[in-house]
């Protein structure tokens, strides 16, 4: 309900003069022209339909806000200058002016802090015509005022493009303190000082601040807003808030958690994505970061072999992505793998170990003692070799790959043969006479093809020229393979 706070009612056409000082009420302040005299407004217009009855067409001199050059001079009547009220109350205030009927097409607009108030505001203009003058009362009402309604309100009247401005009406909405800056959650280093800030405003001022830590007041005497609390350091998580007090009461800020930075939790769910003979691709889920961003991670790897005192390998990597390809591993081996990550405080523990295996590798050595000789009667080349001394990591031998290249008169042709793992000799048909045949052999496992032996060359003469002398791989230390013809 709107209640009025006003001076003694005076019948129209007399208008209220200035109120003494300002009006302060915990009820709604309503300043309006009383209608107790029995006069009723003749016309009512909304702000979007300005105007009044036409009374003639008269030229008007220019008007400034400093003073009207209109004859007679026109000015808004004085009204209350300052209204103080509590938040959520209703308020109504007005400005009034008497305009000679010689003027027409007058409009009144409301302005707040220099900006015109347009749209859905509760502004009503009432016209009270008489023989010589028309009394105009512009009322502005606000229901359930908020702090944002604080400000300086004025009326402006345009008469034939000239402007008359009223004295300002200052609206001051008072309420509980309003926070303009609240403490923020923080992650801090153990036993290290940090600051929290709290700022609240009225009106009414002053606003006093009390700090609260874990439900207990920190300062016995209040501090004027704004307040900075310096906490010398914490050893465990705490919740801080601030209380802002003014004459209207108290407002409590949000509670903010101050976390103590700690080492991270170990990563979890270390997974194998791909294994090759010499590498393993892993991923992990980071643990809790200890309220401090991860900086980097470390992958620890150890070969799991009951017979070996396998050395520990440590690979450092970035914290993101949570993935790493471990390289330089032995083929066909088992590894225990763990991951730890660090933040600014320190390293996490290593994740629980996972077991991972590399696949079979290709042989690392070539077959030994390769010898080649020509069997002219059968028109083929005999090749013999010794099984390579492959490591178990190379996996099971599945066979051999024989490369033989035939070169004659500028023409070169390479052929490949595959033979089973039980063989240590092979025969290949002579492809070209009067040519050089170059033979190389590689061992093959499921992991791939190993290195080829050093080339062994044999000359294949034209038909009828027999030579049974073999060619063979060189003895260790020889620079070039021996060619025996």
């Amino acid at each position: 309900a709107i209640t009025e706070a006003r001076e003694e009612a005076k019948p129209y056409p007399l208008f209220p003069g200035p109120l003494p000082g300002s009006l302060q009420t915990d009820h709604t302040s309503l300043l309006s022209l009383p209608h107790t005299s029995g006069y009723q407004p003749a016309l009512m217009f909304s702000p979007t339909q300005p105007g009044r009855p036409y009374t003639g067409n008269v030229a008007i001199p220019r008007v400034t806000s400093a003073g009207s050059k209109l004859l007679p001079p026109l000015a808004f009547k004085h009204t209350v200058g300052h209204i103080i009220l509590s938040e959520h109350k209703d308020v109504k205030f007005n400005c009034s002016i008497s305009v000679p009927n010689i003027y027409q097409d007058t409009t009144i607009s409301w302005w707040k802090d220099g900006k015109e108030l347009l749209g859905a505001h509760h502004a009503i203009t009432q016209f009270y015509p008489d023989d010589e003058v028309t009394a105009i009362i512009a009322s502005f009402s606000i229901t359930s005022v908020q702090r944002s309604d604080n400000g300086s309100y004025i009326c402006k009247m345009k008469i034939n493009n000239e402007e008359i401005v009223s004295d300002p009406i200052y609206i001051e909405v008072q309420g509980l303190p309003h926070f303009t800056k609240q403490p923020e959650s923080m992650n801090v280093t153990r036993n290290t000082a940090f600051n929290l800030t709290c700022q609240a405003v009225g009106p009414p001022e002053p606003v006093n601040i009390f700090w609260v830590q874990n439900s207990s007041r920190v300062n016995e005497q209040p501090e004027k807003s704004p307040s900075v609390l310096t906490v010398p350091g914490l050893t465990e998580m705490a919740v801080f808030s601030c209380e802002a007090h003014n004459d209207k009461g108290l407002t409590v800020s949000k509670g903010v958690q101050i976390n103590i930075k700690a080492i991270p939790s170990p990563p979890t769910e270390v997974s194998i994505h791909n294994s090759t003979a010499h590498s393993i691709l892993i991923s992990w889920v980071p643990g809790f970061d200890g309220y401090s961003p991860f900086r980097n991670c470390s992958v620890q790897v150890k070969e799991v072999d009951p017979l070996s005192n396998g050395s520990v390998m440590i690979f450092n990597t970035s914290a993101s992505p949570h993935m790493y390809q471990i390289k330089q591993l032995q083929a066909l081996a088992n590894y225990s793998i763990g991951v730890s990550c660090m933040n600014e405080i320190g390293w996490s523990a290593v994740s629980p170990w996972i077991l991972a295996s590399t696949t079979e590798g290709a042989p690392s050595v070539a077959p030994l003692n390769v010898t080649v000789f020509l069997n002219e009667s059968r028109d083929n080349v005999d090749i013999r070799w010794m099984k390579p001394l492959t490591k178990r990591q190379a996996g099971e031998l599945v066979g051999y790959r024989i490369s033989h290249v035939w070169q004659s008169a500028g023409i070169s042709k390479e052929l490949l043969e595959e033979v089973g793992q039980n063989n240590s000799r092979a025969q290949i048909s002579v492809q070209v006479h009067n040519a050089t045949c170059t033979v190389r052999i590689a061992a093959v496992t499921k992991g791939g093809v190993g290195p080829f032996s050093d080339p062994v060359k044999i000359f294949i003469p034209a038909h009828g020229w027999v030579d049974h002398a073999p060619s063979s791989t060189p003895a260790p230390g020889n620079a070039d393979p021996v060619l025996i013809i």
């Epitope: 470390s298 150890k302 440590i314 390293w347 523990a349 629980p352 077991l355």
Partner: antibody, heavy 117, light 107 residues
Amino acid sequence: EVQLQQSGPELVKPGASVKISCKTSGYTFTEYIMHWVKQSHGKSLEWIGGINPNNLGIIYNQKFKGKATLTVDKSSSTAYMELRSLTSEDSEVYYCARDGYFGFDYWGQGTTLKVSS
Amino acid sequence: DIVMTQSHKFMSTSVGDRVSITCKASQDVGTSVAWYQQKPGHSPKLLIYWTSTRRTGVPDRFTGSGSGTDFTLTISNVQSEDLADYFCHQYNSYPLTFGAGTKLELK
């Protein structure tokens, strides 16, 4: 040969603290995590926590957080466990054990702690 | 926490027998299980890791098997020096946990 040599038996008063040591030899101290285990009633084993001497990453069994503090001295290749606010329930045998990357492959000989007034 | 349950606190056997000690995990631990032997007055000694890998120097009469939640330590041809407490241990997730132990004794 890998060896973990623990400090001798301790007799302490309730409320006091004790620091047990585990001196290692025969391997690179920083390459292996050191764990501590409590054995109650000569039977069940309880993991207390582990420390990585390489980067000082530590993890505790929640049950022993606040009770045990693990540290290392790299220069002497020694791991330590401090137990505080001791009560009669802490009167047990405590082992240090090296993490072989797949279980605890070497154990200290154990330190017997007796808390009594 | 993962609970490792060794259902038999005691198991009676004779020299030359075959005995199986079981351990059940309260949730899947993959193959991250180790077995320890402890004799009176001594520290535990690692026998088996990764469920089935025998540690160097451990006699081949000790074998480990299982995966997921059910694990077994089998001693074939039990010898008198095998009479001891046996503990299973999971290292799949923190906190690391042990079984309550099974005491192997002579009939």
